[in-house]
């Protein structure tokens, strides 16, 4: 009887050792959905156990109260509950506690206090119409109808937002409404003219820290104005035979001109400078016209108009031909974002603060879609992404403006997004040797690259054998494989390697010879020493004993006529001749292995080749070395940053002292780093190749028809004056 | 339905004593604060003391503070006034009314007693 | 203190009538304001509390409204049983005041 009762207490005690009581709701919010319902949320919102919940409510300011339960039929584990009309009365305050009940106990919440003004959401207003009024420009007057459901009595506060039709950045407008009119209005000033702009309405009493959802969205029109203004630019051309400089303008709606606006027609007029009186005008509807011009400075206007008048006029400066140029651009950057490519530029000039930004593809063909933006009072360029196209590569110049003098470009190229090369290599083997092999390449076309091709990677192996790789710069297009096997057949492919990727060129095959040149000079040089030496011993034993040697060479032949012959029986000339025979044999089949010129079935075709090719790799050979030094010199001189690479520069306007560095590998997301690299070390930017093609006119600022970048390779001698080269 | 039933209160003679007491039903008793409000004969309304739902907090009008003791007895619903020292001018109808049910609530009186009179002369 | 002021002192309305009673505090009650009436040899009756909340079992035809330090009792329609003393009080502070009382009766 009484171990029973003992272990009854130790279970009793076991019990409640093990008894887990519910978590402490916490974390007490609750929200006032005006005359529909008033609900509470917390946390714990699951229990390891099963937990039901009560809620205690006090209302009606306290002289009321009443319990909502969250019990196994309803909510269950739910850590939510609402109370109904008709006891939701607005204003109160209620007071909130949280009772979390399991089968081991009770935990009460703190208490929390409510005052419903302060947590009332009530529905959304709703827009009826967004219109211009007439003779008021740039104002749109807003009209909704205030929520059925919202306290009459009380001060709604609203928040409009707005933005132009083609933008997704909001803005937003905060004002309070005391009338309690259904029908509300609000007049949106300081729009930009003759604008569609999408509106939506939110609302909450005064107090409230709870909005009403947003309203549904609706478009209005601002009314139509004179056109706002023109962006002028122009692409200078080479001059012609005759003297006349063609000129390409270019026009567009200036930046902040309504989405909307059409102009019907452009006026142009221009004159050179100090001579008005030489004025020539055109009218056109396009937004592009070339002008031709003489050799002195222009000056261009142009003016966009509509049936309410013209809009400011757009001015430009053509230089004088003969007209020097200033240069303030040091270096400069491309980097990608996430979804933008962000150009950056460092100046020596800080009074410009005015920068035109061309961009255009660099394709091999005529530059199709040329585009141009104008840049204030910043360093930097930025464009989305996806105005770009993938795996193109763009040409991107930057021309610093100086109240009317537009100064020397400064470019960069760039794509938004590298892909593998599009096709390989188109690869051949020159100069085969015996171990070694000169493999030569062609650039991959420009319009097959996808990305600036970082390396390219040599693939060989032997018939059976394993496979062998090298990887060479970009700039390299040659290289000379050696400690290859005698007389081996070898495959042999091209990798081209951009950041995405690499790409194989062709496969080819070849043989290594079984026999160097220099072997058969050694062979032709021994048998032609050991005939010298012959000769030379004979001239001497001829010296010596002329009668011998006479005797030799010229033998005597007996007479016929006092031959005995006849007499001589046939066995012994049989004899005789056999004798002859065994004192002077000869194997033919060692004779094949042992002849010096014998040789495989190619080497003779290849022979011919060889010998030439031989004077080739040993000139090939030195200018390889001479490279070698001068990449190992320009390596010290400029130490380029990380995400700077080396490819064609493309700005046609070259300064005399400084080569640029002018494309940019383009690391995601790495801005900042590459700004301090940059910018850090200006002076060291080193160019890798400089490109140009045709003659370059000291006039052509970045002209469109000097825009093709064909690369120099391989100089054997610098070009002088015009620009300064660092051979690569 | 909720009921305040007061005591019967009586004659005192100034500087005497007189315990009042009410009797709850028809709610939770201990839940609400409760109240003593008094109505002298042909005058108004005047509050005299609040005692909190647990007796922990209790309020006075500055007149009765130190003669008067307000007091509950959760357990048998009961709310109690205690007058000492009384003076003619603490002669009223003392009504016993129920209070909020929270220490913030505004201190009205939704439900009152039937009133118990309380005379103070000599 | 709290001084509420109430006004009229007395008032007589015919049947039908509509009534306002004024209940003027001496500093900002912030709606901590309840409606009380009496009738001879009777317990007040809660009426109105919160400045215009009804309590439960009043006639329609009682509203209360204001806010800050002025406040108002409105009976639309006068009927017999509205005869009676209105008090208006103040929740908010201790001590707890009430207005000297309003005498409606019927004309």
């Known amino acids: 009887m009484m171990w029973a009762k003992v272990l009854w207490m130790l279970l009793l005690l076991c019990k409640l050792s093990l008894a887990v009581l519910p978590a402490k709701p916490e974390n007490i919010s609750c929200i006032f959905y005006y005359e529909e319902n008033f609900t509470c949320t917390w946390s714990p919102e699951k229990e390891a156990s099963y937990t039901w919940y009560k809620v205690k409510r006090t209302y009606s300011y306290g002289y009321k109260s009443d319990i909502c339960s969250t019990d196994n039929s309803t909510r269950g584990n739910h850590a939510s509950c609402s109370f109904l009309p008709p006891t939701i009365t607005n204003p109160d305050n209620y007071t909130i506690q949280v009772e979390a009940q399991n089968a081991d106990g009770i935990m009460k919440s703190d208490i929390t206090y409510w005052n419903l003004d302060a947590i009332m959401k009530i529905e959304p207003p709703e827009i009826f119409s967004v219109k211009s009024v007439l003779g008021i420009k740039r104002m749109l007057q807003i009209k909704w109808i205030r929520p059925v459901l919202a306290p009459h009595s009380s001060t709604l506060k609203y928040t409009l937002r707005f933005r132009t039709i083609n933008s997704a950045y909001w803005m937003e407008v905060n004002f309070t409404k005391e009338d309690i009119d259904r029908d509300e209005t609000y007049n949106l000033t300081e729009l930009q003219a003759f604008t569609e702009y999408v509106m939506t309405l939110r609302c909450a009493p005064a107090e409230s820290m709870f909005w009403s959802g947003w309203s549904q969205e609706k478009v209005g029109t601002t009314e139509e104005e004179a056109p706002y203004g023109l962006d002028l630019w122009r692409v200078l051309k080479p001059a012609m035979v005759d003297g006349r400089r063609p000129v390409q303008l270019m026009w567009k709606k200036a930046t902040g001109a309504p989405v909307l606006e059409k102009a019907l027609g452009y006026n142009i007029w221009y004159f050179p400078e100090n001579n008005t009186n030489l004025t020539e005008t055109v009218n056109t509807t396009n937004q592009t016209h070339e002008l031709y011009l003489g050799g002195k400075t222009y000056w261009v206007y142009v003016v966009s108009y509509n049936s309410l008048g013209e809009s400011p006029v757009a001015t430009l400066r053509i230089p004088a031909l003969n007209e020097k140029t200033f240069q303030c651009i040091e270096a400069m950057q491309a980097c990608l974002t996430q979804d933008q490519l962000v150009v950056e530029w460092q100046s020596s000039a800080p009074e410009v603060d005015t920068w035109m930004v061309e961009w255009f593809p660099d394709v091999d063909s005529e530059p199709s879609s040329f585009s141009w933006e104008s840049v204030s009072q910043a360093r930097n360029w930025t464009i989305q992404k996806d105005e770009l196209k993938p795996l193109w590569c763009y040409n991107i110049s930057v021309y610093p403006v100086l109240r009317d003098r537009v100064g020397q470009p400064y470019s960069t190229q760039a794509y938004v997004q590298e892909g593998i090369p599009s096709a390989g290599p188109v690869t051949q083997a020159d100069s085969i040797g015996v171990k070694t092999v000169t493999i030569t390449w062609k650039e991959i076309p420009k319009s097959k690259r996808n990305g600036f091709i970082k390396n390219y990677t040599i693939f060989y192996q032997a018939e059976d054998g394993k496979e062998f790789s090298k990887t060479v710069n970009s700039n390299i297009l040659q290289y000379r494989l050696e400690s290859l096997t005698r007389r081996t057949s070898y495959s042999l492919q091209v990798m081209a390697s951009t950041n995405a990727g690499g790409t194989n060129g062709t496969k080819i095959n070849f043989k290594t010879l079984s026999i160097s040149v220099l072997e058969i000079f050694f062979i032709t040089s021994l048998v032609g020493g050991g005939f010298l030496i012959l000769i030379m011993l004979t001239v001497a034993y001829g010296l010596k004993k002329p009668n011998k040697l006479k005797h030799l060479c010229w033998p005597d032949v007996p007479n016929p006529a006092e031959s005995s012959i006849a007499t001589w029986r046939g066995d012994d000339f049989k004899d005789k001749l056999n004798l002859k025979e065994s004192d002077d044999p000869v194997n033919m089949e060692e004779d094949q292995v042992l002849k010096p010129y014998s040789a495989p079935t190619d080497f003779i075709d290849k022979l011919v080749v060889n010998f030439e090719n031989f004077l080739e790799e040993v000139s090939t050979e030195e200018l390889g070395k001479s490279q070698e030094n001068i990449l190992k010199e320009e390596k010290n001189k400029h130490v380029t940053s990380p995400y700077c690479l080396h490819h064609p520069p493309i700005s046609t306007e070259i300064p005399q002292r400084k080569p640029q560095q002018l494309c940019s590998r383009i690391p995601e997301g790495t801005c900042s780093e590459t700004k301090e690299q940059l910018f850090s070390s200006v002076q060291s930017l080193g160019p890798d190749h400089l490109c140009e093609e045709g003659e370059p006119n000291p006039y052509l600022k970045n002209s469109v028809t000097t825009r093709e970048f064909v690369c120099l390779k391989n100089f054997k001698t610098k070009p002088k004056e015009k620009f300064s080269v660092a051979v690569a | 339905e909720v009921q305040l039933v007061e005591s019967d209160g009586g004659l005192a003679q100034p500087g005497r004593s007189l315990k009042l007491s009410c009797a709850a039903s028809?709610?939770?008793?201990?839940?609400?604060?409760m109240a003593w409000v008094r109505q002298a004969p042909t005058k108004g309304l005047e509050w005299v003391a609040t005692?909190?739902?647990?007796?922990?907090?209790?309020y006075y009008r500055d007149s009765v503070r130190g003669r008067f003791t307000i007091s509950r007895d959760n357990a048998k619903s009961t709310l109690y006034l205690q007058m000492d020292s009384l003076r003619s001018e603490d002669t009223a109808t003392y009504y016993c009314?129920?209070?909020?049910?929270?220490?913030?609530?505004?201190?009205?009186?939704?439900?009152w007693g039937q009133g118990t009179l309380v005379t103070v002369s000599s | 203190d709290i001084q509420m002021t109430q006004s009229p002192a007395s008032l007589s309305a015919s049947l039908g009538e509509t009534v306002t009673i004024q209940c003027q505090t001496s500093?900002?009650?912030?709606?901590?304001l309840a409606w009380y009436q009496q009738k001879p040899g009777k317990s007040p009756q809660f009426l109105i509390y919160?400045?215009?909340r009804l309590e439960d079992g009043v006639p329609s035809r009682f509203s209360g409204s204001g806010s800050g330090t002025q406040y108002s009792l409105k009976i639309s329609s006068m009927q017999t049983e509205d005869e009676g003393v209105y008090f208006c009080?103040?929740?908010?502070?201790?001590?707890?005041?009430f207005g000297a009382g309003t005498k409606l009766e019927l004309k």
């Open positions: 009314a129920r209070g909020p049910l929270t220490d913030w609530a505004p201190n009205w009186f939704a439900y």
């Open positions: 028809g709610f939770t008793f201990s839940d609400y604060y």
């Open positions: 005692i909190s739902y647990d007796g922990s907090s209790t």
């Open positions: 500093e900002d009650i912030y709606s901590g």
């Open positions: 919160g400045a215009s």
């Open positions: 009080q103040q929740g908010l502070k201790y001590p707890n005041t």
